[in-house]
Interface confidence: low
Amino acid sequence: GELETSDVVTVVLGQDAKLPCFYRGDSGEQVGQVAWARVDAGEGAQELALLHSKYGLHVSPAYEGRVEQPPPPRNPLDGSVLLRNAVQADEGEYECRVSTFPAGSFQARLRLRVLVPPLPSLNPGPALEEGQGLTLAASCTAEGSPAPSVTWDTEVKGTTSSRSFKHSRSAAVTSEFHLVPSRSMNGQPLTCVVSHPGLLQDQRITHILHVSFLAEASVRGLEDQNLWHIGREGAMLKCLSEGQPPPSYNWTRLDGPLPSGVRVDGDTLGFPPLTTEHSGIYVCHVSNEFSSRDSQVTVDVLDPQEDSGKQVDLVSAS
């Protein structure tokens, strides 16, 4: 007869490992007992359990409560055992020794491999600002056994670099994603993808990119200068910019204080019925935590009386 087992048994941390050992004997042969031991290189054998055909299962104190026989029905030639709740320290070589009648003793070895699935963590880098050079956007670390694979899934253009630290029973892999920040990256997802044989599917952690920037400021409202005449109601200037974080707006007048009745409402400067007092240079200040910008415009309030008077003069002169 001969023993049937596996070269390698692979189990995920915390699961039960079935250690197979089946005697395929000739007709009439019987298994008297099966001894299981851990036999790592350089260390003496450590007994796990003894499975006796008459007296049943005896588990050594070191494995009390962790070694069981598979559930019935059981074949008398099957010396397999279950190792409950596998931990990393269980990884190693195991041997089953089978005593048979009348053929004598047989032994076989297998390797137990305990997969430790990673628990990845994603750490954002320093604050991203437009105008920086190549900058760390995020790093992703996953530790497991065997070493996990760490990659990135994103539409953003960047470069990656990886390093790994080997520990006694596992390996930690850190991948870093670098990019040159631009405002178009705002709100874009950067996803760390961790693959590992102990995972049913890849683990994904997503970080949303935030890039600080502030666009140039411009002022709207003076497109038609002829509308800015004495008496006009509802005249307004609007300051245009955009940024991350969203900017705040402030209005000042370069050649003196804001005239009375002028309302500041965020990015908008609202005027009462226009008078010549409203002529002047107005400055919109736009700022956020990243930067600040200014845009200035000159308001020249027209007096229709003066204009019509000039026209009459011109007509009479001709």
């Epitope: 750490n123 880098g125 320093p126 920086q132 050079g133 190549l134 900058t135 760390l136 790093s139 530790e143 390093r163 630290f165 520990h167 930690a172 670098h178």
Partner: antibody
Framework: QVQLQQSGPGLVKPSETLSLTCTVS????????VHWVRQPPGKGLEWLGV???????DYNPSLKSRLTISRDTSKNQVSFKMSSVTAADTAVYYC???????????WGQGTLVTVSS | DIQMTQSPASLSASVGDTVTITCRAS??????LAWYQQKQGKSPQLLVY???NLADGVPSRFSGSGSGTQYTLKINSLQSEDFGTYYC????????FGGGTKVEIK
């Protein structure tokens, strides 16, 4: 407030093991890494190793075989051991806190360790 | 290991001066750089991290700049409490420190 308080002997004999303890307060060891840095008299700073918030350790490759960093989170303590010391290991030893990166925002007061018979 | 070369090794300056200290890395460290100040007999104190970010409580007269392999710490309007030794330190892989710059009173 955040504090790192160091303790340990100031004199160690050659070939023996240097042992220092860093007791922290004001933050949790499960949220921050604790590093060890040394400074020989009149010289610059040298990074020795770290125990990260998750419990894993990294060491300076040039000293790795002699260093062990461990922690007891229930006591808020980090332990540093350096075996087989020589006179060249005479230095002020600091523990220091970091977040996810290797820069140090809070430092212990430092312990001068002299290696001499 | 990445080597950090700091210059100058020492300098003399007066209160009110502007002081510039540079640090060169032997390879690109992608802004993974910190600056520390250390006074005689005291522990180092973090001034700047990630090349340009001022640590909490650090006066605005300190500023960090640079990218790639070249980095600078600038102190505007030097104060009497700014005298001491300054170190740069990269944190791109195994950390190493620069040799230090001693800022003394002229």
């Amino acid at each position: 407030q955040v504090q790192l308080q160091q303790s340990g002997p100031g004199l160690v004999k050659p070939s023996e093991t240097l042992s220092l303890t860093c007791t922290v307060s004001g933050f949790s060891l499960t949220n921050y890494g604790v590093h060890w840095v040394r400074q020989p008299p009149g010289k610059g700073l040298e990074w020795l190793g770290v125990i990260w918030s998750g419990g894993s350790t990294d060491y300076n490759p040039s000293l790795k075989s002699r260093l062990t960093i461990s922690r007891d989170t229930s006591k808020n303590q980090v332990s540093f051991k350096m075996s087989s010391v020589t006179a060249a290991d005479t230095a002020v030893y600091y523990c220091a806190r970091s977040g996810k990166w290797y820069y140090f925002d809070y430092w212990g007061q430092g312990t001068l360790v002299t290696v001499s018979s | 290991d990445i080597q950090m070369t700091q210059s100058p090794a020492s300098l003399s300056a007066s209160v009110g001066d502007t002081v510039t200290i540079t640090c060169r890395a032997s390879q690109n460290i992608y802004s993974n750089l910190a600056w520390y100040q250390q006074k005689q007999g005291k522990s180092p104190q973090l001034l700047v991290y990630a090349a340009t970010n001022l640590a909490d409580g650090v006066p605005s007269r300190f500023s960090g700049s640079g990218s790639g392999t070249q980095y600078t710490l600038k102190i505007n309007s030097l104060q009497s409490e700014d005298f001491g030794t300054y170190y740069c330190q990269h944190f791109w892989g195994t950390p190493t420190f620069g040799g230090g710059t001693k800022v003394e009173i002229k």
